[in-house]
């Protein structure tokens, strides 16, 4: 028969024949032959391979270095790598999460639109008219101006995006 030019899924072509790939969690020891199956070997502790493969070495589990603000979110297995995330108050600098930076704070005049997570930074938004923020914070949203009317008071000083309104007593003098 003609030697194959392509192989089925979970197989690879070598020496004009189709060999089975090694399953996740195992590495290749020797290719199959006309008479023998592919020989695979489990990855050891602290190693993994996450795909059907013909790798001769397993990969090392990632180290979540606490000196870089990292911690383990999920321990690796023979089929999965360790997943790192950042300590409280920090977030990853990249998708691979190789290091962490402190969450950004929103300056006065800005409020938190979305609180940071281990993988995304704080999202700030300017306080719209009627709202203010007088602190630099990674958690505080813009607060609405105090409603003087509901307290039977009047606005003595207008609010800004950084300050609340100042309420005062109603003027007793009536025309």
């Amino acid at each position: 028969p003609e030697p194959p030019t392509a192989c089925r899924e979970k197989q690879y072509l070598i020496n004009s024949q189709c060999c089975s790939l090694c399953q996740p969690g195992q590495k290749l020891v020797s290719d199959c032959t006309e008479f023998t199956e592919t020989e695979c070997l489990p990855c050891g502790e602290s190693e993994f391979l996450d795909t059907w493969n013909r790798e001769t070495h397993c990969h090392q589990h990632k180290y979540c270095d606490p000196n870089l603000g990292l911690r383990v979110q999920q321990k690796g297995t023979s089929e999965t790598d360790t997943i790192c995330t950042c300590e409280e108050g920090w977030h990853c600098t990249s998708e691979a999460c190789e290091s962490c930076v402190l969450h950004r704070s929103c300056s006065p005049g800005f409020g938190v639109k979305q609180i940071a997570t281990g993988v995304s930074d704080t999202i700030c938004e300017p306080c719209p008219v009627g709202f203010f923020s007088n602190v630099s914070s990674a958690f505080e949203k813009c607060h609405p101006w105090t409603s003087c009317e509901t307290k039977d008071l009047v606005v003595q000083q207008a609010g800004t995006n950084k300050t609340d309104v100042v309420c005062g007593p109603q003027d007793r003098l009536r025309a």
Epitope: G44, S46, E47, Q60
Partner: antibody, heavy 118, light 106 residues
Framework: EVQLVQSGAEVKKPGATVKISCKVS????????IHWVKQRPGKGLEWMGR????????KYDPKFQGRVTMTADTSTDTAYMELSSLRSEDTAVYYC???????????WGQGTTVTVSS | DIQMTQSPSSLSASVGDRVTITCSAT?????ILWFQQKPGKAPKLLIY???NLASGVPARFSGSGSGTDFTLTISSLQPEDFATYYC?????????FGGGTKVEIK
Amino acid sequence: EVQLVQSGAEVKKPGATVKISCKVSGFNIKDYYIHWVKQRPGKGLEWMGRIDPEDGDTKYDPKFQGRVTMTADTSTDTAYMELSSLRSEDTAVYYCTTSYYVGTYGYWGQGTTVTVSS
Amino acid sequence: DIQMTQSPSSLSASVGDRVTITCSATSSVSYILWFQQKPGKAPKLLIYSTSNLASGVPARFSGSGSGTDFTLTISSLQPEDFATYYCQQRTFYPYTFGGGTKVEIK
């Protein structure tokens, strides 16, 4: 600084049970496997077993199976190894050690001496 | 169980010598670890994943091998290297150590 600090030396009678602790600091115990290793006086290292502190999963060497129990308390970052039905051959230094990661040392405790004597 | 056989069990060498220790497994393993132990002290990881130096280990130590046969080499023996060396496989339970190789001063 990463440390594994083990409990102090023990003297036990044959048939008794010993429980050794291994308190870790500088890392979260759930992030590593904790292995226990036995070393008799003047002899080599013997792997006894390991525990995954995260879920309590254990693997024991069959020659200790039935006599050894490994546990971990994640709230105090402490692993324990209990060995029962002690005999004279259990006189040894017992070490706790971690799985390794690239860039780490594969940490070890200082060892706990257990003497079994009538 | 996989047996790990180290040879020699002891050797005498001088400072500056090149020293080779072998570790043989009864079946193929993914990798081995090498440890150094000095009297009265806990073992110390020297090499992980067969050939990678652990943090802080001098470059005179190297590891090689695959499958069933592995080697630890000290290119130029230093006074602080006189110790006992152990290999360990962590592929199949129960994980097993070699019997150790004691490196003594000639």
